[in-house]
């Protein structure tokens, strides 16, 4: 059972979003006193796996040689020391892409946007889905989520953004998935390049800039849902 020991750290390499068939390594890092590491997967018999620690005993490796649907899900790890079992780690959500055909991503009215105006990114799937996800490459918070506007399955979801500034510029892809399996995503859409025009080179605007003047660069994370951008698969339900 959980004791007073500090919780371990759990992470995945090369990341927590893995294409079908690719390998992934899950790491659990505890303390030098650890004698054994245990990995639990939600909705699977516990423990899902056990490993002896690697020298110098403060971490263990759990290997997945080829990613499949069976490995997608939510994981926690523990370690055992001479005084008992640790608290559980924070959860790791391992997501598999490639479960469904790729959606199409487009920009309305155009992928060329003037700073201070709006744009809507439209993710469309061939078959009805109920969750759509948008990612911006090389973003501080790369994974951004929206459940489709209605609970019923839809062929598309809209990601409205306003006002647009230079931070919104970049390469986007979207995914679709079914609500019954949050950890299985489609293949990624083809990339969409969003170009924001009218930006100034000077990132420090004068304090008297009016709305008719173009905006300068912005360091605000993109927030299509209006909430704190999420990394991992924590969804923003509308």
């Amino acid at each position: 059972q959980a004791g007073p020991l500090p919780k371990p750290t759990l992470w995945a390499e090369p990341g927590s979003v893995i294409s079908w068939g690719n390998s992934v390594t899950i790491w659990c890092q505890g303390t030098l006193e650890a004698r054994e590491y245990r990995l639990d997967k939600e909705e699977s018999p516990a423990p899902w796996d056990r490993q002896n620690p690697l020298e110098p005993k403060n971490k263990a490796r759990f290997s997945i040689p080829s990613m499949t649907e069976d490995y997608a899900g939510r994981y926690r790890c523990y370690y055992r020391s001479p005084v008992g079992w640790s608290q559980p780690s924070d959860p790791l959500e391992l997501v598999m892409t490639g479960a469904y055909s790729k959606p199409t991503l487009s920009a309305l009215p155009s992928p060329l946007v003037t700073s201070g105006k709006s744009v809507t990114l439209l993710c469309q799937s061939r078959s009805p889905m109920d969750t759509f996800l948008l990612i911006k490459e090389r973003a501080a918070h790369p994974l951004l989520h929206l459940r489709s506007e209605h609970g019923a399955q839809q062929h598309q979801a809209e990601f409205p953004m306003s006002p647009v500034t230079s931070v919104h510029g970049g390469t986007y892809r979207c995914f679709s998935s079914h609500g019954f399996s949050h950890y299985l995503l489609s293949h990624p859409s083809d990339p969409l390049e969003l170009i924001v025009s009218g930006s100034l080179e000077d990132p420090r605007p004068s304090p008297t800039r009016s709305v008719s003047t173009a905006a300068g660069p912005e360091d605000q994370p993109l927030m299509p849902t209006g909430s704190v951008p999420h990394s991992g698969l924590r969804r923003h339900w509308e």
């Epitope: 105006k117 409205p160 006002p163 605007p205 300068g216 360091d219 927030m223």
Partner: antibody, heavy 118, light 107 residues
């Protein structure tokens, strides 16, 4: 729970200055753009200014351009509006509001009244 | 600037009535149209964003529709607590602009 609390309003003479503050809590302030919106007594709503999360991009309405300055201190979870060269027509309740990133203002403060009169 | 024309400026209705307010933009604003409710002495509250999406905690009797320049806000069955002034706002292009408001009263 998202909370926005304005302060700093009061009576000021034409040509005078005032600094409004908005204290934010219940959300990660540094992740959101913020607005000031005003409402003259018995009138409609007028958007005043907008500042993005990192202060690097700012917009103003033409009616306040050159007189008002919006700023923020993310370490203090605070938004500010420095109002100079105040005019009688600036008399209004001033609200701070959180930007939702989709063209709307999803949470508003209770407002602070600014009266410009001699 | 984009002008927002809201109508009617006031209306009187009975509890249980279906109430409709319209908002017209001077140019195409796509779906970037929001609706707010304001009660006397209080701050506005967001009800609907992006034309038809209900803000969290807002009762389902409120709805919105439209696109481009013409938009509609509907209360399917008026409740006593809905007595307020309602504003539309375009979020398509800065400066963001509001309609003049519709004051809703109980008959």
């Amino acid at each position: 729970e998202v909370q926005l609390v304005e302060s700093g309003g009061g009576l000021v003479q034409p040509g005078g200055s005032l600094r409004l503050s908005c204290a934010a809590s219940g959300f990660t302030f540094s992740d959101y753009g913020m607005h000031w919106v005003r409402q003259a007594p018995g009138k409609g709503l007028e958007w005043v200014a907008y500042i993005f999360s990192g202060s690097s991009t700012i917009y103003y309405a033409d009616t306040v351009k050159g007189r008002f300055t919006i700023s923020r201190d993310n370490a203090k979870n605070s938004l500010y509006l420095q109002m100079n060269s105040l005019r009688a027509e600036d008399t209004a309740v001033y609200y701070c509001a959180r930007a939702d990133g989709r063209g709307a203002m999803d949470y508003w403060g209770q407002g602070t009244l600014v009266t410009v009169s001699s | 600037d984009i002008q927002m024309t809201q109508s009617p400026s006031s209306l009187s209705a009975s509890v249980g009535d279906r109430v409709t307010i319209t908002c017209r933009a001077s140019q195409d604003i796509s779906k970037f149209l929001n609706w707010y409710q304001q009660k006397p002495g209080k701050a506005p509250k967001l009800l609907i964003y992006y034309t038809s999406r209900l803000h969290s905690g807002v009762p389902s009797r409120f709805s919105g529709s439209g696109s481009g320049t013409d938009f509609t806000f509907t209360i399917s069955s008026l409740q006593p607590e809905d007595i307020a002034t309602y504003f539309c706002q375009q979020g398509n292009t800065l400066p963001w602009t509001f309609g003049g408001g519709t004051k809703l009263e109980i008959k």
